[in-house]
Amino acid sequence: IWELKKDVYVVELDWYPDAPGEMVVLTCDTPEEDGITWTLDQSSEVLGSGKTLTIQVKEFGDAGQYTCHKGGEVLSHSLLLLHKKEDGIWSTDILKDQKEPKNKTFLRCEAKNYSGRFTCWWLTTISTDLTFSVKSSRGSSDPQGVTCGAATLSAERVRGDNKEYEYSVECQEDSACPAAEESLPIEVMVDAVHKLKYENYTSSFFIRDIIKPDPPKNLQLKPLKNSRQVEVSWEYPDTWSTPHSYFSLTFCVQVQGKSKREKKDRVFTDKTSATVICRKNASISVRAQDRYYSSSWSEWASVPCS
Amino acid sequence: RNLPVATPDPGMFPCLHHSQNLLRAVSNMLQKARQTLEFYPCTSEEIDHEDITKDKTSTVEACLPLELTKNESCLNSRETSFITNGSCLASRKTSFMMALCLSSIYEDLKMYQVEFKTMNAKLLMDPKRQIFLDQNMLAVIDELMQALNFNSETVPQKSSLEEPDFYKTKIKLCILLHAFRIRAVTIDRVMSYLNAS
């Protein structure tokens, strides 16, 4: 048993039929010695008396909020959560495996630039009685500070018969230099609690590997005289690291017909303009990627040819 | 249709062209190592990230763009200098700060060159003949060092009397290539910044 937060404890259980469980001793946080009784959750059934209560925790029915009272007054609470281990593996029932970029990916993170700010998100099909807590650091043996906000529900989607909920959190490295060469990864730890079930999930990455720029901005077309060609121009996204001559981007320009089957013309350039042939009913899209370190491409910015 | 990107005129800023070649060469070599040594811990997640230049050169700090010198987190405990203007030591007179930055890059290249050559000598003795260093990468390191045009003593290649442990050597190669790729990215950023200055 270990303390997760003040008055909240996690009991780690080997989960198999007829498992003996864990013996837990709860102590009432009070100077009082006599006349103390214990109850569980909303029940008025007295489980025991005295300053300590010894319980055998085997299943979820044994978890919950244990309260000690004296003469109708609440003295203190101890909330017990269960962490299941099945065949030597901690349960991962709460979050959905996103399977990208590989199996057992429960947390995904992205950064728009090298400022040390990043966003992580995760998916669940659980709609209620759900709490997350996020911690992060740079390195684990001598951790350096990363501050994370509260997790929030960021999207709801219908997937077949199921509803899927996306939660996200923003974190900021306390002292980040955009030009630094990372040698220690960022560690992200998410505590997830559903009803009385506790689980934890972790992710480890370098900011350079999770970079995904915002799409280029101010995408414009300028027709060239007596030609089917147009000059496409754009700008670096506002969120990208500066100076741009140091944190340079490379771009992919695509001409795409109305039909997905039509051949796509693609041009790669380091400049912020390109000359392409604009076909009728086609659209021109531009996306960006770090010029020197091949992490993710941005989403496309698009304009119609007409 | 994938149209290649036009490379800038090398006469304009020789080091930019060489640094781009360097990044391409080290990235290709790293990819080859990851594929060839697929049963060795050679991915970014698996290796220890070591920097052989740590406490010997200070390229990131010495080459910090002027705009980032206001960022407290970039001004570590070391005495930091930063780029102001100029180009590679090709034509125009460069400032003291720039010379410091470029000489730090030169020292990095020299250290990696020695390590890679020593390692290649060991790999050539491997009866499996599984992987060797790309001669193109070694040549590109040499070209950039020449373009930087610093005179410094030649560091003798390390020689070892004991029998090489080929498993350890291959893991060391992965560590070295990952670190050198990261440094090559920094060098490319610096050259791009100088080219724009």
């Epitope: 003040k6 946080d29 909020q65 909330l79 709490t131 996020v134 | -």
Partner: nanobody, 123 residues
Framework: EVQLVESGGGLVQAGGSLRLSCAAS????????VGWFRQAPGKEREFVAA????????RYADSVKGRSTISRDDAKNTVYLQMNSLKPEDTAIYYC????????????????WGQGTQVTVSS
């Protein structure tokens, strides 16, 4: 059950700000999630914001998202709702409510309620 007392309401001009407080009695507040609800005259009680035990998860109604921030200070047994860019339609009695552990958006899921604090936004 935990006892709750709201404060910080009042009359404010449109575009102004208010900070509501919800103080809990007892030393056992840290295991509770707290929600803010509001009820305008002749309307149903509606969810505004909620914060979990430990403050690790927050939730906001679409109507206040981006304008409100919920936070908690367990050392003071208090939850705060900072409301900015107030609009006349934010006029209502604001209630705080508590339940063990998890946040919820339905009033029926909360066991303990405060008496409420009046917020009036004039145009």
């Amino acid at each position: 059950e935990v006892q709750l007392v709201e404060s910080g309401g009042g009359l404010v001009q449109a575009g102004g700000s208010l900070r509501l407080s919800c103080a809990a009695s007892g030393r056992t507040f840290s295991t509770y999630a707290v929600g803010w609800f509001r009820q305008a005259p002749g309307k149903e009680r509606e969810f505004v914001a909620a914060i979990s035990w430990g403050g690790g998860t927050v939730r906001y109604a679409d109507s206040v998202k981006g304008r409100s921030t919920i936070s908690r200070d367990d050392a003071k047994n208090t939850v705060y709702l900072q409301m900015n860019s107030l609009k006349p339609e934010d006029t209502a009695i604001y209630y705080c409510a508590a339940r063990v552990l998890h946040i919820a958006t339905k009033a029926v899921d909360f066991g303990s309620w405060g008496q409420g604090t009046q917020v009036t936004v004039s145009s």
